[in-house]
């Protein structure tokens, strides 16, 4: 892993920061922000290289990926906040995203280092969050069939479908992490 250095939010464009913020006082928050910075860089690259800039809700509905998202029942919002339920749900969601990131890493045609960085730091984040969850058995393992359908999409010959899917995974992970960041701050 890169050695600790400037935090993700400290440079002119935090998306290009190459150091994991391992010395931060609030490591979970800083790590989430670090990953968000990397996702920003990847989305910018998708936009510049593959002209994949806009969200396509239609494509999201079509590809049937069932990407994790936080809902009211997950206890992560101001109303009905439940720290234990929320931490469990965030951790489970990130475990699911890890599978997607693993496949994405093998199929991404741009900056593989950034994808690898997102994947590895998400893995670290999962471990950090798991250590805060009281009942670790509640952190469920994702369904491997989702994995297979994603693998098929990303190995598709249709470049547009492939790029749209990658864009959607990054956009969904970004949304998930932004909600997670708010939830962590409120604790």
């Amino acid at each position: 892993f890169p050695t600790p250095g400037p935090l993700a939010g400290d440079s002119k464009d935090d998306a290009t920061s190459n150091s994991l913020p391992l010395t931060s006082a609030n490591k979970v928050e800083e790590l989430i922000k670090y990953i968000l910075g990397k996702i920003s860089a990847l989305r910018k690259e998708m936009c510049d290289k593959f002209n994949k800039c806009e969200d396509s809700k239609e494509a999201l509905a079509e590809n049937n990926l069932h990407l994790p998202k936080l809902e009211g029942k997950d206890g992560c919002f101001q109303s009905g906040f439940n720290q234990e339920t929320c931490l469990t749900r965030i951790t489970t969601g990130l475990v699911e995203f890890q599978l997607h990131l693993n496949i994405l890493q093998n199929n991404y045609e741009g900056d593989k280092e950034n994808v690898k960085s997102v994947h590895m730091s998400t893995k670290i984040l999962v471990q950090m969050l798991k250590s805060k969850v009281k009942n670790q058995d509640e952190v469920t393992t994702p369904d491997p069939t989702t994995d297979a359908s994603l693998q098929a999409i990303l190995q598709s010959q249709d470049e547009c479908v492939k790029h749209t899917t990658i864009h959607l995974i990054l956009r969904s992970l970004e949304d998930f992490l932004q909600f997670s960041l708010r939830a962590v701050r409120i604790m």
Partner: antibody, heavy 117, light 107 residues
Framework: VKLQESGGGLVQPGGSRKLSCAAS????????MHWVRQAPEKGLEWVAY????????YYADTVKGRFTISRDNPKNTLFLQMTSLRSEDTAMYYC???????????WGQGTSVTVSS | DIQLTQSPASLSASVGETVTITCRAS??????LAWYQQKQGKSPQLLVY???TLADGVPSRFSGSGSGTQYSLKINSLQPEDFGSYYC?????????FGGGTKLEIK
């Protein structure tokens, strides 16, 4: 929603002061809280933040090590313990409720702190 | 630390006009930005959070937009009660700094 600050006044340089903020009209323990200050004829300056269960606490660099934010959820009260006060700490101090995004959706009327000999 | 640069520092406008205040961040703040209005001798009031979400009770003539490092607050058809100072604030990485403020005066 009502936030009422108290504890302001005249303090000597190097002295201490504890500000309180009494909250009512909402479930205090569900919200993060901020302290913000405003020097006379100046802009707003964020001072400190505390999460609902006090797990998350942040300070501005200008007050780090001198000020301590805390809360008493059963008593619906937010505190700001200020030590080693300097003339540049002279300001109106506001407590504010944090919404889900961290933004301050409700503010108190403020309490004035003057640091002078 | 992320710095927020607000512009203009002051502006004069007439009732009915449309004005735009901008806030530039020194780094990407991922839409973690709020706008406040403060009238002389009063506490600030939240107008917009999450860069573009209007706070409860705020008139629809106010709107926030932007992303990355560039954000703006637009006020359509200025009303007499809109005059005062406006501040942006980010919630990305601590310290959660405010912009220097914009004083909006009646022409």
């Amino acid at each position: 929603v009502k936030l009422q600050e108290s504890g302001g006044g005249l303090v000597q340089p190097g002295g201490s002061r504890k500000l309180s903020c009494a909250a009512s009209g909402f479930t205090f323990s569900r919200f993060g809280m901020h302290w913000v200050r405003q020097a006379p004829e100046k802009g707003l300056e964020w001072v400190a933040y505390i999460g609902r269960g006090s797990s998350t606490i942040y300070y501005a660099d200008t007050v780090k090590g001198r000020f301590t934010i805390s809360r008493d959820n059963p008593k619906n009260t937010l505190f700001l313990q200020m030590t080693s006060l300097r003339s540049e700490d002279t300001a109106m101090y506001y407590c504010a409720r944090s919404n889900w995004d961290g933004a301050m959706d409700y503010w108190g009327q403020g309490t004035s702190v003057t640091v002078s000999s | 630390d992320i710095q927020l640069t607000q512009s203009p520092a002051s502006l004069s406008a007439s009732v009915g006009e449309t004005v735009t205040i901008t806030c530039r961040a020194s780094g990407n703040i991922h839409n973690f930005l709020a706008w406040y209005q403060q009238k002389q001798g009063k506490s600030p009031q939240l107008l917009v959070y999450n860069a573009e979400t209007l706070a409860d009770g705020v008139p629809s003539r106010f709107s926030g937009s932007g992303s990355g490092t560039q954000y703006s607050l637009k006020i359509n058809s200025l009303q007499p009660e809109d005059f005062g100072s406006y501040y942006c604030q980010h919630f990305w990485s601590t310290p959660w700094t405010f912009g220097g403020g914009t004083k909006l005066e009646i022409k």
